[in-house]
């Protein structure tokens, strides 16, 4: 039913559905080391990992989405792994006037889900 | 820079990138034909294609997981097609009491982007 | 694990100079800032400004603009903060903060005393 | 520049008891606001970043919530440990300013 929960446990096995995963990124990763100061080490945490059926389905049309992959996996992608919220991120910047905060509300993940 | 617009023609030719497809769905697809009167049929938008490069990037996060996947694919997935907006549905309902109508809010996307 | 070791005590007359050191370990220094904090005796804590250790650009509060200085030695991973012309109301206890990406800092010296006094 | 005020200035709570402290911006700082305990003689400890992430190692007890100008450090239930000044912060912009602090005391 679209009212089942979602399935928080995982059936593939440990670290294989999707969660929250810490990568570390330079700025010049980024490709920002012109026009940001500091930190110039940033701990990205991203979503990885699969979306097994029903496994942290985000709403109704991720249910959905799961069922029909399973009746036209051709057709219907299965849901896959995105941020569900974000943790605010603050940088220093260079400006044409000095140095100035800038926060980022949607760059780091806070928690995942299957959409 | 992070500040780059999300790019929105896509390199990989037409309808291979992140875009709404309609997918036809009878109620017993769904398991909903219990307690779902009508409509038996459902026009279910739904995001599929890929995601290159800064292709519909849903935001700043999904730029820096473009060019990190980029930079270490087998750490870092690419940002996929999900939902950016969903159009409300009404479906009959069978209950006790007879019949009611339910808004489905988050069951037929409206639009995609890549997160 | 993160580190900020911070000079010892200073007895310094007005109109002297002062300088406060830093050392930090446990990372890489030219990836932060560092912040510097002071706390007047019985008082709250009062921003002093921030550098940055990979680029030596600072941002000082505007009370203390043309009086403080900070600097940093990359070769010893060593932050410096100089207040010049001390008054009596710059007595107080100085830190040095490592900055983070998400402004609140858990990243303390321990703190430097350092007293105005005739 | 943005002033933080707290309320408080002084708050007697008993140990087992809830206590709520109080942050009030004079402009929004969005969700950029921390908050410090100090005990004497020691550096501040970051208990909260982003007006309501608990830093690492930080109790349960300890939880903030607000954004834009009113946020709110609440301790469920007070231990011994806990009586210390409380400081909030925001890093919305430059100057970065602290408030004035809360003293949590023993009633």
């Known amino acids: 039913s679209a009212h089942a929960h979602p399935r928080d446990s995982c059936p593939l096995g440990p670290g294989r559905c999707c969660h929250l995963e810490t990568v570390q990124a330079t700025l010049e990763d980024l490709g920002w080391s012109d026009w940001v100061l500091s930190p110039r080490q940033l701990q990205l945490s991203m979503c990885v990992g699969e979306c097994p059926h029903l496994y942290r389905s985000a709403n109704t049309h991720a249910q959905i989405k799961a069922r029909l992959h399973g009746l036209q996996p051709d057709k219907v992608p299965a849901p896959c792994c995105v941020p569900s919220s974000y943790t605010p991120v603050v940088l220093m910047h260079r400006t044409d006037s000095g140095v100035s905060l800038q926060t980022y509300d949607d760059l780091v993940a806070r928690g995942c889900h299957c959409a | 820079s992070a500040h780059a617009h999300p790019r929105d023609s896509c390199p990989l030719g037409p309808g291979r990138c992140c875009h709404l497809e309609t997918v036809q769905a009878t109620l017993e697809d769904l398991g909903w034909s219990d307690w779902v009167l009508s409509p038996r049929q459902l026009q279910l938008s739904m995001c599929v294609g890929e995601c290159p490069h800064l292709y519909r990037s849903a935001n700043t996060h999904a730029q820096i997981k473009a060019r990190l996947h980029g930079l270490q694919p087998d750490k870092v997935p690419a940002p996929c097609c999900v939902p950016s907006s969903y159009t409300p549905v009404v479906l009959m309902h069978r209950t006790d009491s007879g019949v009611s109508l339910q808004t489905y809010d988050d069951l037929v996307a409206r639009g995609c982007h890549c997160a | 694990q993160v580190q900020l070791v911070q000079s010892g005590a200073e007895v310094k007359k007005p109109g002297a100079s002062v300088k406060v050191s830093c050392k930090a370990s446990?990372?890489?220094?030219?990836?932060?800032?560092i912040f510097w904090v002071r706390q007047a005796p019985g008082q709250g804590l009062e921003w002093m400004g921030w550098?940055?250790?990979?680029?030596?650009?600072?941002h000082y509060a505007q009370k203390l603009q043309g009086r403080v200085t900070m600097t940093t030695d990359t070769s010893t991973s060593t932050a410096y903060m100089e207040l010049r012309s001390l008054r009596s109301d710059d007595t107080a206890v100085y830190y040095c903060?490592?900055?983070?990406?998400?402004?609140?800092?858990?990243?303390w010296g321990q703190g430097t005393l350092v007293t105005v006094s005739s | 520049e943005i002033v933080m005020t707290q309320s408080p200035a002084t708050l007697s709570v008993s140990p087992g008891e809830r206590a709520t402290l109080s942050c009030r911006a004079s402009?929004?700082?969005?969700?950029?606001l921390a908050w410090y305990q100090q005990k004497p003689g020691q550096a501040p400890r970051l208990l909260i970043y982003?007006?309501?992430t608990r830093a690492t190692g930080i109790p349960a007890r300890f939880s903030g919530s607000g954004s834009g100008t009113e946020f709110t450090l609440t301790i469920s239930s007070l231990q011994s440990e806990d009586f210390a000044v409380y400081y909030c912060?925001?890093?919305?912009?430059?100057?970065?300013?602290f408030g004035g602090g809360t003293k949590v005391e023993i009633k």
């Open positions: 903060v490592r900055d983070t990406q998400y402004g609140g800092s858990p990243y």
């Open positions: 446990g990372y890489t220094f030219t990836d932060y800032g």
């Open positions: 550098i940055t250790a990979y680029s030596g650009d600072t």
């Open positions: 402009q929004s700082v969005s969700s950029n």
């Open positions: 982003g007006a309501s």
């Open positions: 912060q925001q890093y919305n912009n430059w100057p970065i300013t």
